[in-house]
């Protein structure tokens, strides 16, 4: 494998020419201007000081310019996501310049060596940008660096080294190992561009976190909590085939950031929204579905520029595949009394009925415990747009679904053999839609019957006062 890299990030490669033997110095970072959506097209290789390729490939000095930066690789060949991203950018921004930063010779190394090469690659990009800035009409403000994994930190270095400030850097699951907790000048950080937005899809609090856990941008978005991505479980990626390994799960979750970004480009009519929250647990409890004071934003390409004084962590749920958009609902259930609850938490399900569609039966995830004489908040989400909600069916699951719960029930029975039956009283459910920011209160169909017990269900209909709108802004999409 190529080892001798000079300070300029070049690799020596002896080429034997027909007439004379000579050593040609080949750049270890290449900039390929993708002029066409056609993958067969060779594009144009740009190099500092050479204006001809810019003319040959009709580089548009006044248009947006995207630099796509891949990450560490175990292969000498581009990974498939690159084609999808280039194609999506061409589809969405027809006049834009799309440049692939090919640093495979420096990335196809031991991970530690590739990490050490990120600075060199960042310098190369900065030099290219400095040279382009010398051209009339070229503006750094129109530059958008998109870096995946290790490439996100390369983008950070480029933004740090360039003369001036690039318009935007998008970090797609920035690499974690050797960057977690690092100094801001040694990783992607908010001061690397006018706007730095980040998608975190493979963060782990235990074991090795492939993606960085800490927030590193102006906005840091953690889809599905930033860890377990739907459709990436062993069962999903392996199907019935036994050939796969855990590597496929890692790739699926890590690469999900790229596909979420691609989705935002090609499915702009189905934007996904993320909501500001202090942590994943609070988001799972349904507490953070507000759009007040810039607390929500579109994810990916459509993200609105937010330059907060301090970093903003945002969360959302997604589908398992494109289009990734789901519809989030906050459900506030006031439990005003309960009887004989015992040790175990009830398992609740809701079904939402709307003007457009009805949801599947959705579990209410109890993050901590059901509180009595208190409002319990839950997050539920649907894959389809239900329209205006009409009614809700709340079901308390009967027979326990887990051995753990069965054991707890058995213990409960031993201590209270004549348990007269567990019961909860719920009068109303307040629902807030994350996507529309509309709030609605649902009351029990029969005001006299507010109790629910295991194996039973309770129906709620829209209360007479109907939709209540608070002065909360809806997360409208502002297309860049």
């Amino acid at each position: 494998s190529p080892v001798p890299f000079g300070p300029e990030g070049r690799l020596e490669d002896k080429l034997h020419k027909p007439k004379a033997t000579q050593t040609e110095v080949k750049p270890s970072v290449r900039f390929n201007l993708r002029t066409s959506k056609d993958p067969e097209h060779e594009g144009c290789y740009l190099s500092v000081g050479h204006s001809q390729p810019l003319e040959d490939c009709s580089f548009n000095m006044t248009a947006k310019t995207f630099f796509i930066i891949h990450g560490w690789t175990m292969s000498g060949i581009f990974e498939n996501w690159l084609h999808k991203l280039v194609s999506a950018l061409h589809t969405r921004e027809k006049d834009a310049n799309v440049v692939v930063v090919d640093w495979l010779p420096l990335a196809h190394q031991l991970y530690t060596d590739a990490v050490n090469n990120t600075r060199v690659v960042g310098h190369s990009i900065a030099r290219m940008l400095d040279w382009l800035q010398e051209k009339d009409d070229f503006s750094l403000g129109n530059v958008h660096l998109i870096g995946y994994s290790l490439g996100a930190h390369v983008a950070g270095y480029a933004g740090n080294f360039v003369k001036g400030t690039v318009g935007r850097i998008t970090g797609l699951d920035p690499a974690g190992p050797m960057f977690e907790g690092a100094d801001i000048h040694k990783r992607l950080s908010p001061d690397d561009a006018d706007f730095v937005d980040v998608l975190h899809t493979y963060t782990r609090s235990f074991g090795l976190s492939i993606g960085i856990q800490m927030p590193v941008g102006h906005i840091d978005i953690y889809p599905n909590g930033g860890d377990f991505q739907p459709g990436c479980g062993l069962n999903d990626v392996l199907g019935s085939i036994a050939y796969g390994t855990i590597t496929e799960v890692v790739k699926c979750e890590h690469e999900r950031a790229v596909h979420l970004f691609v989705d935002s480009l090609v499915n702009q009519d189905k934007p996904s929204f993320a909501f500001q929250c202090t942590d994943s647990n609070r988001f799972k409890k349904g507490i953070c579905l507000s759009c007040r004071k810039n607390r929500c934003n579109s994810i990916g390409y459509n993200a609105k520029k937010m330059r907060n004084k301090r970093n903003s962590k945002m969360y959302l749920k997604t589908r398992a595949g494109m289009p990734f958009r789901v519809y989030h609902y906050q459900m506030k259930i006031h439990v005003f009394s309960y009887k004989n609850m015992g040790e175990i938490e009830p398992t609740f399900y809701v079904t939402l009925y709307g003007t457009n569609a009805d949801s599947q039966t959705l579990p209410l995830e109890i993050v901590e415990r059901i509180e009595q004489n208190a409002t319990n908040t839950f997050l539920v989400y649907t894959e389809e747009d239900l329209g205006d909600l009409l009614k809700i069916q709340l079901t308390w699951e009967g027979a326990s679904q887990s051995w753990y719960n069965l054991w707890k029930e058995f213990r409960s029975y031993l201590s209270q053999p004549r348990n007269p039956g567990r019961e909860l009283n719920i009068r109303r459910i307040r629902v807030k839609s994350g996507e529309t920011q509309r709030k609605l209160t649902f009351c029990t169909e029969d005001p006299e019957n507010t109790s629910i017990s295991p194996g039973r269900e309770l129906w709620f209909r829209k209360c007479r006062d109907g939709w209540r709108m608070k002065n909360e802004t809806s997360p409208t999409v502002e297309l860049p």
Epitope: R30, P39, G76, F78, N80, L104
Partner: antibody, heavy 119, light 107 residues
Framework: QVQLVQSGAEVKKPGASVKVSCKAS????????MHWVRQAPGQRLEWMGG????????TYNEKFKDRVTITRDTSASTAYMELSSLRSEDTAVYYC????????????WGQGTTVTVSS | EIVMTQSPATLSVSPGERATLSCRAS??????LHWYQQKPGQAPRLLIK???QSISGIPARFSGSGSGTEFTLTISSLQSEDFAVYYC?????????FGQGTKLEIK
């Protein structure tokens, strides 16, 4: 026009090695990946691996990883595929194929090299 | 490893008629699907790339569609030279894999 010309047919004994060459012309050899695909009689096509001729980085099918080596000589615009520890099941037609910029589809193929493994 | 399954194994169609060939992937491959034609004693020839992109020099009667796990190659009006074996190939993840082929024969 783009052309990929492969070396001639080979007959090998089990346990031996074979090295097939593929000379490219009509395009910049270092700008596109080169892949090797084989086809045993009556069987589906099987991707063996590929090389990035620009710097020599390779990717192999795990099935062949311990036995296949793909190399290139940029001065001769030629890619090579060497398969070792040959067995009768390796009897097949071996093709080189030029990848697109991303290495995903193969618009140009060599004429194929028949390798027969027989004792 | 992504397994590609083509159907039917053999398709008998009369010249001038329409032929529809199917290819299924064992998991989502987005649009990373390519179609090839192979005649006896010849190397495969690329017909369609990335599910639906046409190839210069390939007659317009060849078209591709699909995304995710289900893909289709359609030959709108069969010519005598179209009778051959057709393969699909995925490039979504390594190892790249091919289908077992569909033999298109004259009815």
């Amino acid at each position: 026009q783009v052309q990929l010309v492969q070396s001639g047919a080979e007959v090998k004994k089990p346990g031996a090695s074979v090295k097939v060459s593929c000379k490219a012309s009509g395009y910049t050899f270092t700008d596109y990946t080169m892949h090797w695909v084989r086809q045993a009689p009556g069987q589906r096509l099987e991707w063996m691996g590929g090389i990035n001729p620009y710097y020599g980085g390779t990717t192999y099918n795990e099935k062949f990883k311990d036995r296949v080596t793909i190399t290139r000589d940029t001065s001769a615009s030629t890619a090579y595929m060497e398969l070792s520890s040959l067995r009768s099941e390796d009897t097949a037609v071996y093709y080189c194929a030029k990848g697109d910029y991303y290495g995903g589809s193969y618009n140009y193929w060599g004429q194929g090299t028949t390798v027969t493994v027989s004792s | 490893e992504i397994v590609m399954t083509q159907s039917p194994a053999t398709l008998s169609v009369s010249p001038g008629e329409r032929a529809t060939l199917s290819c299924r992937a064992s998991q989502d491959i987005s649009n990373s699907l390519h179609w090839y034609q192979q005649k006896p004693g010849q190397a495969p020839r690329l017909l369609i790339k990335y599910a639906s992109q046409s190839i210069s020099g390939i007659p317009a009667r060849f078209s591709g569609s699909g995304s995710g796990t289900e893909f289709t190659l359609t030959i709108s009006s069969l010519q005598s030279e179209d009778f051959a074996v057709y393969y699909c190939q995925q490039s979504n993840s390594w190892p790249y894999t091919f289908g077992q082929g569909t033999k298109l024969e004259i009815k």
